[in-house]
């Protein structure tokens, strides 16, 4: 009689995480008695999934009865597959005995868990940036499985060329996590811009997942100021006003200064918001010409964001009213702590 | 005090790389930008670029793309500039300056870093 | 690129006088203008920022004015000190350009 074979069809079995795999066995006689055993891995360090006689496993079931007496199927269905079941697994049977010893070997199925990447995550740098800066978004995502992998990056709806991408472990996993750089340019008009990341894997059918970052969160755009004299008001009232255009974010400070002292100080609340998502504001004071003697440098100070502050100045010409006269002149304190700030 | 340490000065080979060191005492590095200023006397102060090591954002003149890399390193406040593919018209001298982030002027200026490209 | 023009490349002036140095953007910088001072064999100092406003330690002499394309530079009552090479620059674009050069002696 021809000699026991044992018989594994699959070469390699491919399954989505979550899933059951079913590994088919079969052997080609009854002879010689003894029970079949499951393992992963070959050698010393093989781990036993499933074994006929005796123990516990209960992610394991067998697809036929394997208790009769005549049964040549020991195919095995395993439940719930993480990328940690990975692996080639090798049905042995095993000839009676004190103890029972191996007689023969299946060639091994490949099992290969297939597994969704998770939701990519884009994170940006650590402080705002200004426009024409160009800076840094990563993403990431993990726990997927084959390692082939797309990622592509778009700003909006245009798609990014500069970006480095690295996927880990380098060598055979269970399973594999992306990571990617991408630089990219601010402009003036980003505010209501997005930066996406996105990645493609045969676990998505055809759908990738998205990340997305907010270019709102990173960057900041500095404002103009105006600074203009409104006609007279009263006999001896000037209207000065200082616009403040295009500026992002909303947090802004402002100090009017006659001759260099502290007129008032307001906070931006009631702003416009621009289309491009940066705010303009206006603010006005009403200067009593007929308290001042000589002429007097209006000053427009601003302080947007935390930032130095930068201002403003208009030159009102108390001989010369009620026209409208003087010069814009502009100023800007850096705010180094050796600076005198207003 | 606030001041600005450049490396001392490079005499290279046409075709060889130059990295120049600027290192930041007496304020907080990522708070500033650090920009790059070439001087010669065909030209006069030319803007190579700026890295802002908060951020690490960057932005660069593209007259020096491709041939000077930016770099900062936080934890030695430091910030580099590499010239790379060197000829005669690198020869000059070139100075780290801060600046606050967007929009502010240059108000310290290191010593400058004297680079001389000769065969 | 935004140009920077300082109309003349170099000036005399007697002790005392008043001078006015032009620098003038190829378009508009809102006000981000920077005055620097160098002189020979020194890195540039910072005068004036924001086109008005005088970096501490300048000396009231010295003042800046302008908006919109055009700005000056002026030093009143000159110094045997002040002569130096005066850069103008603009930061409001990048690259950030600087003008030529206004090179000051003394007759």
């Known amino acids: 009689e021809e000699e026991l074979q044992v018989i594994q069809p699959d070469k390699s079995v491919s399954v989505a995480a979550g899933e059951s795999a079913i590994l088919h066995c079969t052997v080609t006689s009854l002879i010689p008695v003894g029970p079949i055993q499951w393992f992963r891995g070959a050698g010393p360090a093989r781990e036993l999934i499933y074994n006929q006689k005796e123990g516990h496993f209960p992610r394991v079931t067998t697809v036929s009865e394997s208790t009769k007496r005549e049964n040549m199927d020991f195919s095995i269905s395993i439940s719930n597959i993480t990328p940690a079941d990975a692996g080639t697994y090798y049905c042995v049977k095993f000839r009676k005995g004190s103890p029972d010893t191996e007689f023969k070997s299946g060639a091994g199925t490949e099992l290969s868990v297939r597994a969704k990447p998770s939701a990519p995550v884009v994170s940006g740098p650590a402080a705002r940036a200004t426009p024409q800066h160009t800076v840094s978004f990563t993403c990431e995502s993990h726990g997927f499985s084959p390692r082939d992998i797309t990622l592509k990056w778009f700003k909006n709806g245009n798609e990014l060329s500069d970006f480095q991408t690295n996927v880990d472990p380098v060598g055979e996993s269970v399973s594999y996590s992306i990571h990617s750089t991408a630089k990219v340019v601010l402009t003036r008009e980003d505010v209501h811009s997005q930066v996406i990341c996105e990645v493609a894997h045969v676990t998505l059918q055809g759908d990738p997942l998205r990340g997305t970052a907010n270019l709102s969160e990173t960057i900041r755009v500095p404002p103009t100021l105006e600074v203009t004299q409104q006609p007279v008001r009263a006999e001896n009232q000037v209207n000065v006003t200082c616009q403040v255009r295009k500026f992002y974010p909303q947090r802004l400070q402002l100090t009017w200064l006659e001759n260099g002292n502290v007129s008032r100080t307001e906070t931006a609340s009631t702003v416009t918001e621009n289309k491009d998502g940066t705010y303009n504001w206006m603010s006005w004071l009403l200067v009593n010409v007929s308290a001042h003697r000589d002429d007097v440098k209006l000053t427009c100070q601003v302080e947007h964001d935390g930032q130095p502050a930068v201002s403003k100045s208009h030159d009102l010409k108390v001989s010369a009213h009620p026209k409208e006269q003087g010069s814009n002149t502009a100023a800007e304190n850096t705010g180094s702590n050796e600076r005198n700030i207003y | 005090e606030v001041q600005l340490q450049e490396s001392g000065a490079e005499l290279v080979r046409p075709g060889a790389s130059v990295k120049l060191s600027c290192k930041a005492l007496?304020?907080?590095?990522?708070?500033?930008?650090i920009h790059w200023v070439k001087e010669t006397p065909v030209y006069g102060l030319e803007w190579i670029g700026d890295i802002h090591p908060g951020s690490g954002g960057t932005a660069n003149n593209q007259k020096f793309k491709g041939k000077a890399t930016l770099t900062a390193d936080k934890s030695s406040n430091t910030a580099y500039m590499e010239l790379s593919s060197l000829t005669s018209e690198d020869s000059a001298v070139y100075y780290c300056?801060?600046?606050?982030?967007?929009?502010?002027?240059?108000?310290?200026w290191g010593q400058g870093t004297s680079v001389t490209v000769s065969s | 690129d935004i140009q920077m023009t300082q109309s003349s490349s170099s000036f005399s002036g007697s002790l005392g006088d008043r001078l006015t140095i032009n620098c003038k953007a190829s378009?508009?910088?809102?006000?981000?203008v920077a005055w620097y001072q160098q002189k020979p064999g020194n890195a540039p100092r910072l005068l004036i920022s924001g086109t008005a406003s005088l970096e501490t330690g300048v000396l009231s002499r010295f003042s800046g004015s302008g908006s919109g394309k055009d700005y000056t530079l002026s030093i009143n009552g000159l110094q045997a000190e002040d002569v130096a090479t005066y850069y103008c620059q603009q930061y409001w674009t990048t690259p950030w350009t600087f003008g030529g050069g206004t090179k000051l002696e003394i007759k």
């Open positions: 378009e508009d910088i809102y006000d981000r």
């Open positions: 300056t801060r600046a606050v982030s967007g929009y502010y002027a240059m108000d310290y």
């Open positions: 007496g304020y907080t590095f990522t708070d500033y930008e």
